[in-house]
């Protein structure tokens, strides 16, 4: 008799997920030498910890604490890039500007990137048919709350100006309810961080409006300012040619504006 | 066959300055993390310092962080460990060793020995 | 600075088994690779187990290590006199960004 396993909205465990994380820290570790001694099996082991045998729908912060041990990685504190829906482009950035880190260029970031997973109440089992959905079935699932502990401690880590790239497409360019808005601009630490510095990221090759002065801008300004951390922005208006003057700076083009 | 062959050790006064040597062969030593260990008369091992390969990162103990220097020399195959206000307990044999990517040391030099007294 | 527990000493009888513990922290064997080191009185020391329990070529197989949440342990089956020595575990620790060695244990063969 099949054993009844609950139905989620979202989808499942993506496929070989274990495998998966265990090749990806062995990778990280190669690529990163100064992690060279970290043992990826235990990392994998309180990784599958804090979700294994619990209901996907009452996982907290706690369940993760075993594996956040891991994430006293040192990145510089003062070269932090943080993100809101424009991924894509801020880990373009940071392969050129290599001594700039999204928290996806951490270990623990660099594992769960793309991926989903959860387990069941009471069964060892990793569920590969659905998983919760944020929305639809509940915002305290493996992989809401995996992001939301490794966002507020990285978050939390940065120091002197912290960068933010966001997306001047969307019609919020700053949305309350992403993990930027509703976490990480929350936890960074005035004492330690001094300036927060937006980066408006332009779609259209012909927008030349300036997107520093949108309503939603402003409202993270004042988010910021009431936190004591000052605030700047900037218009990059040709993201191609943003990262082409990354790559060469010395480029006589990229004097002027981008 | 990989040879490390440390000098510079011996006798100085607390406060005073020493400068350790090793010289590197049988290996690609600009490519390996390489490191300082020291022994104290009838105690245990102590890690004292590591330098990266590539653009150097240096790692310190609790114990001599500011105090010591660790550095390398590729063109030269040699490590060196420069050691400022020298103490007492600072007393051991000074080993150099080679460091392997999964971070264990797998070649050792014979040590040298450094006495700090007055 | 605290290092790795291990038990002082250990001995047994030529032909026997023993084992030495190493207990740490997450810091240090919770989530890094353990080593051991052989160590004779005025040689240089000996990697014998990486990777909490791969052999360099070279090491007999009497000698096997194993780890499980924050410790380790080393185990020399078949007890020879020349196991006579110190043995050392060693970890990185992310708190302290160095390694930390264990206090070393004393092997004696009986």
């Known amino acids: 008799v099949p054993r009844w396993r609950q139905q989620w909205s979202g989808p499942g465990t993506t496929k070989r997920f274990p495998e998966t994380v265990l090749a990806r820290c062995v990778k990280y570790t190669e690529i990163h030498p100064e992690m060279r001694h970290v043992d990826c099996q235990s990392v994998w082991d309180a990784f599958k910890g804090a979700f294994i045998s619990k209901h996907p729908c009452n996982i907290t912060e706690e369940d993760y604490q075993p594996l956040m041990k891991l994430g006293t990685q040192t990145v510089p504190c003062n070269k932090i890039l943080l993100w809101s829906r424009i991924k894509d482009l801020a880990h373009q950035f940071t392969q050129v500007q290599r001594d700039m880190f999204t928290l996806e260029d951490t270990l623990l970031g660099y594992l769960a990137d793309d991926l989903t997973w959860c387990g069941e109440f009471n069964t060892s089992k990793i569920n590969y048919q659905s998983c919760p959905d944020w929305r639809k079935d509940c915002s305290n699932n493996p992989v809401s709350v995996f992001w939301k502990t490794v966002s507020r401690r990285f978050a939390e880590a940065a120091c002197d100006v912290v960068h933010v790239m966001l997306n001047g497409s969307r019609s919020k360019i700053f949305d309350k309810n992403s993990t930027f808005g509703s976490v990480e601009v929350h936890n960074l630490q005035p004492e330690k961080v001094q300036t927060l510095e937006a980066w408006v990221i332009h779609g259209g090759r012909e927008d030349s409006r300036d997107l520093c002065q949108d309503p939603t801008i402003k409202e993270l300004e004042s988010i910021i300012s009431k936190r004591n951390i000052q605030f700047s922005c900037k218009n990059i208006y040709r993201p191609d040619k943003f990262l082409q003057c990354v790559k060469n700076p010395e480029d006589s083009s990229c004097t002027s504006e981008i | 066959q990989v040879q490390l062959v440390e000098s510079g050790g011996g006798l100085v006064k607390p406060g005073g300055s020493l400068r350790l040597s090793c010289a590197a062969s049988?290996?690609?030593?600009?490519?390996?993390?390489m490191s300082w260990i020291r022994q104290a008369p009838g105690k245990g091992l102590e890690w004292v310092a590591s330098?990266?390969?590539?653009?150097?990162?240096?790692y310190y103990a609790d114990s001599v962080r500011g105090r010591f220097t660790i550095s390398r020399d590729n063109a030269k195959n040699s490590l060196y460990l420069q050691m400022n206000s020298l103490r007492a307990e600072d007393t051991a044999v000074y080993y150099c060793?080679?460091?392997?990517?999964?971070?264990?040391?797998?070649?050792w030099g014979q040590g040298t020995l450094v006495t700090v007294s007055s | 600075q605290a290092g790795l527990t291990q038990p002082p000493s250990a001995s047994g009888t030529s032909g026997q088994r023993v084992t030495i513990s190493c207990s740490g922290s997450?810091?240090?064997?919770?989530?890094?690779?353990v080593y051991w080191y052989q160590h004779l009185p005025g040689t240089a020391p000996k990697l014998l187990i990486y990777?909490?329990?791969q052999r360099p070529s070279g090491v007999p197989d009497r000698f096997s290590g194993s780890k499980s949440g924050n410790s380790a342990s080393l185990a020399i089956s078949g007890l020879r006199s020349e196991d006579e020595a110190d043995y050392y575990c060693?970890?990185?620790?992310?708190?302290?960004?160095?390694?930390?060695f264990g206090s070393g244990t004393k092997v004696t063969v009986l």
């Open positions: 049988g290996f690609t030593f600009s490519d390996d993390y």
């Open positions: 990777k909490n329990n």
């Open positions: 997450s810091s240090n064997i919770g989530f890094h690779f």
């Open positions: 060693a970890a990185w620790d992310d708190s302290l960004s160095g390694y930390v």
């Open positions: 330098v990266s390969n590539g653009r150097p990162t240096t």
């Open positions: 060793a080679r460091e392997a990517w999964g971070g264990e040391f797998t070649d």
